[in-house]
């Protein structure tokens, strides 16, 4: 997250970190069910661990943390690397979470976002770009949903209805390491960090997010079919 600020503790209990060995964060994710996460499809890896209820990026033990393995990864059937359409994936955890103030699911919004809606994006991704500098703790950033026309103007021929753009002033954006993390609007999960320009936070080049309102049926049916 570029030019965000430290999230208040316990305010993002659905935020997960996807980790490679040794404790290497590569993506964020979102708890949407006691045993299921949503993340970006481009975050698919064979072997990874899931950390929930953790505030700092470092692997130091925190009393609220819960660690899991991903036992099943189900990317949306319409996703095709290296494209960005349908960029979402469900991950089944090896067991159900223990609900606490630090670990709690969030509901996926069934309403599509309108331009001007104020949202919050969070993650442990780099805070500088193109340099790489990681934060000590989870970062939060207020962003506004942009109209689809502004989104298409920013990225000609690259935007479809499975995506929406959101940003703020130049210099504020999600970035590498934030993929799969939550965009929360009006208390519901509206999007996932997906892609954007490089370097991050360039003027008139907003972040692009997976438009989850288009996928509520797929999410529900996939969880039911695999539970």
């Amino acid at each position: 997250i570029i030019n965000g600020s430290d999230c208040d503790m316990h305010t993002q209990p659905w935020q997960a970190a996807l980790l490679l060995r040794p404790n290497q964060l590569y993506c964020g994710a979102v708890l949407v069910h006691p045993q299921w996460l949503l993340t970006a499809a481009h975050c698919r890896k064979k072997v990874f661990r899931v950390r929930l209820g953790h505030y700092s990026l470092s692997p130091v033990y925190e009393s609220g943390q819960q660690m899991f393995q991903g036992v099943k990864s189900i990317p949306h059937p319409g996703y095709s690397h290296p494209g960005h359409s349908n960029d979402l994936m469900l991950i089944k955890l090896n067991r159900r979470i223990r609900p606490t103030k630090d670990v709690r699911p969030i509901n996926v919004s069934s309403h599509c976002p309108s331009a001007g809606t104020k949202c919050l994006v969070s993650g442990w991704g780099t805070t500088k770009s193109p340099q790489v500098h990681f934060p000590k703790v989870l970062q939060c950033l207020n962003i506004s949903v942009l109209s689809q026309k502004r989104c298409e103007d920013a990225y000609p021929r690259q935007i479809d209805d499975t995506m929406f753009c959101a940003g703020d002033k130049a210099g504020r954006d999600s970035c590498q390491g934030d993929s799969g993390g939550p965009v929360v609007c009006n208390g519901s999960l509206q999007g996932l960090v997906s892609w954007g320009d490089y370097p991050c936070a360039r003027p008139n080049r907003p972040g692009v997010y997976t438009n989850l309102c288009k996928f509520t049926k797929w999410i529900q049916e996939t969880i039911q079919a695999n539970s």
């Epitope: 290497q24 590569y26 960005h84 780099t126 790489v132 590498q176 997906s194 370097p199 972040g207």
Partner: antibody, heavy 126, light 107 residues
Amino acid sequence: EVQLVESGGGLVQPGGSLRLSCAASGFTFEHYSMNWVRQAPGKGLEWVSYISSSSSYIDYADSVKGRFTISRDNAKNSLYLQMNSLRAEDTAVYYCARDLTSMQSRDYYYYGMDVWGQGTTVTVSS
Amino acid sequence: DIQMTQSPSSVSASVGDRVTITCRASQGISSWLAWYQQKPGKAPKLLIYAASSLQSGVPSRFSGSGSGTDFTLTISSLQPEDFATYYCQQVPIFPYTFGGGTKVEIK
């Protein structure tokens, strides 16, 4: 078949210019960042330049900064390297290489260069 | 710039031998290291990315390990087609830099 084909190499005098081209086929060129890498006779690999998929980020090795310019034309599936003020030490085989890391995607994961051309030889000599 | 130091610069080995090549970065690069194989007159070929992930189509006798500053490429049982030069490369930080190469020769 995924393929990169370089062209434009040749013999040039010190101080001269050349423009290398790299034609891409078999993949969606506009989705990938690209690199130029060179190899002097009997030496190792040296990274020369990088360009992101949308051309929004470009970088160069210090040894070529200010003399070489990387560019791309996504509509033509082509990558270019304009080389000016050439020196004897620029003599090398020049490879274009696809970067498997998508810098547009916002995961923190880096791959490497997975597709390489056959190379084109640049000789700088009087 | 990050310096990548490979050792040894050359190694003589026989078919069936286990060969280990090391690469050291001048500063930590997490797991973001790639290994390439290059045969004379040919372009390099990506073998391993992210320090230990095998590129599609690469035989399983090749393996990589390491994190931070120290990395290893291992060929568990050398085959005739493995005689080549091997390079490591750090990929997270510009300028990208390669190691000096390790030539694997027939003993």
